[in-house]
Structure formats: C-alpha cells, structure tokens
C-alpha cells in the first residue's frame, strides 16, 4: 500500500502560509484542483478550488486562501494569509478527475498555529507584515460537490486555512497509514 506522509508546519498567528503542490503536468495541467481540510473522524472538506478547467496563473481567492495554478510548471501554489489558531489542522491538495476518485497530492500538511507573532525570520512568513496584499485579479471559483465511498467534499466556508504539498499523486483509495515526519525549525 502507498504510505501517506505528513509534514508538520508550526507557524504563529498572523503569519502567511505559502506552499506548493506539485503534480504531473502532462496528466493534470488543466484539471481542477482543490484545497481540503481533514478534521478528525470526518471526510475531507473542500475549502477552495481552482476554476474548471483550471486557468493558468490565474489567482482564485476564497476568504484568506489564494490558489494559483502554474500549468507550465506543474505547480499549484496555495497561500493562506493572517493565520489564526483555529486554522490548525490537517490539509491536503487534490485533483478532481470525475467520474474517477480525486487524486491526492503527496503529502498532507499538519498545520499548527500558535498564539503570538514570531519576528524570527523563517519559512513562509512575510517578515513582520501581517497584511498580505491580495492580487486584484482574483476570482472565486465554485467547487463541485463530490461524493464517493471514500471522499466527500463540500463548498468552501467563509474562513479557513491553507497549506499544501508536493511530491507525487496517489488515488485516495490507496490511503492506508500515515507516517509523521520531523519538524524542521
């Protein structure tokens, strides 16, 4: 069985989470991509998605989440600005490919947001800036209601968190165990 890894991000309130999911561009360049949260004991919930078909380098904004799909580069950029403690959770990037199961991109991200802004330079933060200027050309895409025996996604809520990841794709039916990887700080 394919082992699903998990990367842990530890950030402070107010910081920006800025990540990439990489995918096989030959297969999925124009496919619709989505950012999901997985709550304990629940099915994945879609927080934001790209348009269908996904437009190249065209930002889509849902609340504090911004998705930008770079077709030429096989990369989906996921940003979440002004992180809140409540944004803590487990996230994943998926590719919609109806009527088949969504494809999940390795690996999941465990986001831990703690109180108090850190001025220490580090990954995915805009120095001491809490305000992230959102590109003026963003649009909001409608996410499909997608139900399957293993996966349920819903329309995006008003406020959520983001994070994503790269590496490779696996079909959600292949998910078995989760391996935790170390935190790099």
């Amino acid at each position: 069985a394919t082992k699903l890894t998990e990367e842990k991000y530890e950030l402070k309130e107010g910081q920006t989470l800025d990540v990439k999911c990489d995918y096989t561009l030959e297969k999925f360049a124009s496919s619709q991509k989505a950012w999901q949260i997985i709550r304990d004991g629940e099915m994945p919930k879609t927080l934001a998605c790209t348009e269908r078909p996904s437009k190249n380098s065209h930002p889509v904004q849902v609340g504090r989440i911004i998705l930008e799909d770079y077709h030429d580069h096989g990369l989906l950029r996921v940003r979440m600005v002004n992180l809140q403690v409540e944004d803590s959770g487990l996230y994943q990037c998926v590719i919609y490919q109806p009527p088949k199961e969504p494809h999940m991109l390795f690996d999941r991200i465990r986001l831990v947001v703690t109180k108090g802004f850190s001025g220490t330079p580090g990954s995915n933060e805009n120095s001491t800036q809490n305000v992230y200027k959102i590109p003026p050309t963003t649009t909001k895409a409608l996410c499909p209601l997608y139900t399957s025996p293993r996966t349920v996604t819903q329309a995006p809520p008003k406020s959520t968190a983001d994070v994503s990841t790269p590496d490779s794709e696996i079909n959600l039916t292949n998910v078995t165990d989760i391996i935790r990887v170390p935190v790099f700080n």
Partner: antibody, heavy 124, light 107 residues
C-alpha cells in the same frame, strides 16, 4: 562535503542535443528539488525549470518547453538536463542548483547550493 | 512574466564605501526576492533570501530591504573581496526571473 558536481564542457553542432549531469553528494538527494539555470556569455541568469528528484515531477519555463527534459537517477544521486535542437544562442554555462526549503513543500525558491557550471558551446 | 529591472548595471566604489543596488519588479512580488553574488568563474552564492533575511555564514555588512515592487541591496562597507556581480531573483510569480546584474568594482 555537500556539493553538486557537474559534467564537463561540451561542444555541439546546431540541431544536436546535449545532456548535462549533476551529481549530488553530502545530503539526501531526494529531499531537495533540483533547478537548472543558464548564463550566456556576458549575460544574466536565466531559470530553465525544476525537478523533484523524489517523484520525478518537472516543470519547465515556456521558452524551453519541447526542447528540454529533466530527469534523474536516484540510485546514483544524479540529475540530468537534456536540451535538444541546439542553436547558437544556447551557448551558455548551465548550472544545476538545489532549492532549499525549511519545509519541503513551502513556496521558497532559494538556491543555496550550486554546481560549478557546464559550458555548452554550439557552433558549426 | 515578472520583469526585474536592476540598477545600476555597474558601479565603482572605494573600500569602506556604502554600496546600494536596487531591483524593481514589474508587479508586486510580496517580498519574494533573493540576492546572489557571482564571482568570475564561480557559481552564484545566496546572500539574502525573502528580501531581508541574511543567509547563514554571510557577513553582516550585506543587507536587503524593500516591499511591493521595490527592493534594495546594501553593502554597508565595501571590502576588496566583494568585487563581483550581484543579481536579484524573484519568486513571487513563475517563471522565476533574475535582474540583469550589477557589476561592482573597486576604485
């Protein structure tokens, strides 16, 4: 020590292909994306694309699409960049560079480790 | 693509002088900017990342600042070993793009 060692200089004729290698040592090859950057004589730096050595995923700058192929052999910790249909303007030093990221999946494009470069000369 | 306009293209200064190089992006790059040093016959070396963070092992006389579309790289007190070409590189948008470079020489 931590380094990227590139293959030697090449002289090619227009229309031919060149394959440059980049061998990593001193770190886990599959943990960092490899990027390729070139510099024509007297010119600035130009990014060509990236590769995830763990899964083999790649992304290429539009200008090079259809002509460039980035591959790897994880068994020998080596990345490759092949450029086809060479023309005189492809004469340049080609660098491989490691993308450092505190978090593997973060949107950080800092190149903290570079090869010494491979000079590719295209001449008839 | 995001164009990076770097200036000046070259400069000559005395040892101990304060040297400033600027980079202007054609669109907002949200501090997603790095600075590299390239010496003749050698590979580029990362000096500053994410606009203002000093890379480990890099002397503190090097610094970076800026936001939005305008960024500045400063050498507070030029040393003989700083003779090189300096490049900015943005990653606020793909493709990644570099400035044209600034050649720094000693008077």
């Amino acid at each position: 020590q931590v380094q990227l060692v590139q293959s030697g200089a090449e002289v090619k004729k227009p229309g031919a292909s060149v394959k440059v290698s980049c061998k990593a040592s001193g770190y886990t090859f599959t943990s960092y994306d490899i990027n390729w950057v070139r510099q024509a004589t007297g010119q600035g730096l130009e990014w060509m694309g990236w590769m995830n050595p763990n899964r083999g995923n790649t992304g290429y700058v539009k200008k090079f699409q259809g002509r460039v192929t980035m591959t790897r052999d994880t068994s020998i910790s080596t990345a490759y960049m092949e450029l086809s249909s060479l023309r005189s303007e492809d004469t340049a030093v080609y660098y491989c560079a490691r993308r450092r990221a505190v978090y593997r999946s973060s949107w950080e494009w800092y190149f903290d480790l570079w090869g010494r470069g491979t000079l590719v000369t295209v001449s008839s | 693509d995001t164009q990076m306009t770097q200036s000046p293209s070259s400069l000559s200064a005395s040892v101990g002088d304060r040297v400033t190089i600027t980079c202007q992006a054609s669109q907002d790059i949200f501090n997603d900017l790095n600075w590299y040093q390239e010496k003749p016959g050698k590979a580029p070396k990362l000096l500053i990342y994410h606009a203002s963070n000093l890379e480990t092992g890099v002397p503190s006389r090097f610094s970076g600042s800026g936001s939005g579309t305008d960024y500045t790289f400063t050498i507070s007190s030029l040393q003989p070993e700083d003779i090189a070409t300096y490049y900015c590189q943005q990653y606020g948008n793909l493709p990644l793009t570099f400035g044209g470079g600034t050649k720094v020489e000693i008077k």
